[in-house]
């Protein structure tokens, strides 16, 4: 099949980095500046991706491969091939339509991206809270009360109160 194709289609001989130029008797012409062809036998070269604005160039475009972008500091990539950049937040926050907002009481986020997640409910596993949760950290569950030796006690979680540093609404 390949041999037949070669006999019928001179373009199949054009390597990556070139295109089969119909205007020049189907000879193989190099891709023009700012374009590329990643496979052989192409009749056109593709325009290189430009990493503009918050996108930074991670890999320059070449005649045989597209440019690759990542995001400027303070942002992270989303989507296939870093098609979008999304703003980072601080730990203990999540990104909303209104910008970065602190996690609500009872939730945490230990990363600069993603959403605030509820603290682990230790009692569901029959365990007690060893270390209280914060906006940035999940609770640490300890042994179940029954596992504790006589006389020992676990740290009891504080009564749900308003979040530290936040005035009542």
């Amino acid at each position: 099949f390949e041999r037949t194709r070669s006999l019928q289609d001179p373009c199949s001989n054009c390597p990556a980095g070139t295109f089969c130029d119909n205007n020049r008797n189907q000879i193989c012409s190099p891709c023009p500046p700012n374009s590329f062809s990643s496979a052989g036998g192409q009749r056109t070269c593709d325009i290189c991706r430009q990493c503009k604005g918050v996108f930074r160039t991670r890999k320059e475009c070449s005649s045989t491969s597209n440019a690759e972008c990542d995001c400027t500091p303070g942002f992270h990539c989303l989507g296939a091939g870093c098609s979008m950049c999304e703003q980072d937040c601080k730990q203990g926050q999540e990104l909303t339509k209104k910008g970065c907002k602190d996690c609500c009481f009872g939730t945490f986020n230990d990363q600069k991206r993603g959403i605030c997640r509820p603290w682990t409910n230790c009692s569901l596993d029959g365990k007690s809270v060893l270390v209280n949760g914060t906006k940035e950290r999940d609770v640490v569950c300890g042994p179940s009360p029954a596992d504790l030796s006589p006389g020992a006690s676990s740290v009891t979680p504080p009564a749900p109160a308003r979040e530290p540093g936040h005035s009542p609404q």
Epitope: G53, V54, G79, S83, M84, E86
Partner: nanobody, 123 residues
């Protein structure tokens, strides 16, 4: 080609006003959230404001609330940022950006950015 082009920046005295514009082309403008960001010299990019597809939802960073107004004209494929009571700390390059598809639901990523327009607030 999908493109965003900002204009309207310049030198203004403290307390003054400016109106930035962002002209969109190459895509259906009315289908997308639009966002203003700014970058002060030596600082990271800072989100300023965003607006949903029909202009019914608008959000601002605390430091510009009551002074800046984001708006859009879908018939003209244009985004605006009206800035009043400007302060020295508003000095920055201002960028408009397009929210990626499904912005506000599954993510807050931007996929298209303009080249920026410089705003300098100085006496």
């Amino acid at each position: 080609e999908v493109q965003l082009v900002e204009s309207g920046g310049g030198l203004v005295q403290p307390g003054g006003s400016l109106r930035l514009s962002c002209a969109a082309s190459g895509f259906t403008f009315s289908n997308y959230w639009m966002i203003w960001y700014r970058q002060a010299p030596g600082e990271e990019l800072e989100w300023v404001a965003n607006i949903n597809q029909d202009g019914s939802e608008k959000y601002y960073v605390d430091s510009v609330k009551g002074r800046f107004t984001i708006s859009r004209d879908n018939a003209k494929n244009s985004l605006y940022l009206q800035m009043h009571s400007l302060r020295a700390e508003d000095t920055a390059v201002y960028y408009c950006a397009r929210g990626g598809e499904d912005y506000g639901n599954s993510h807050y990523g931007m996929d298209v950015w303009g080249q920026g327009t410089m705003v300098t607030v100085s006496s």
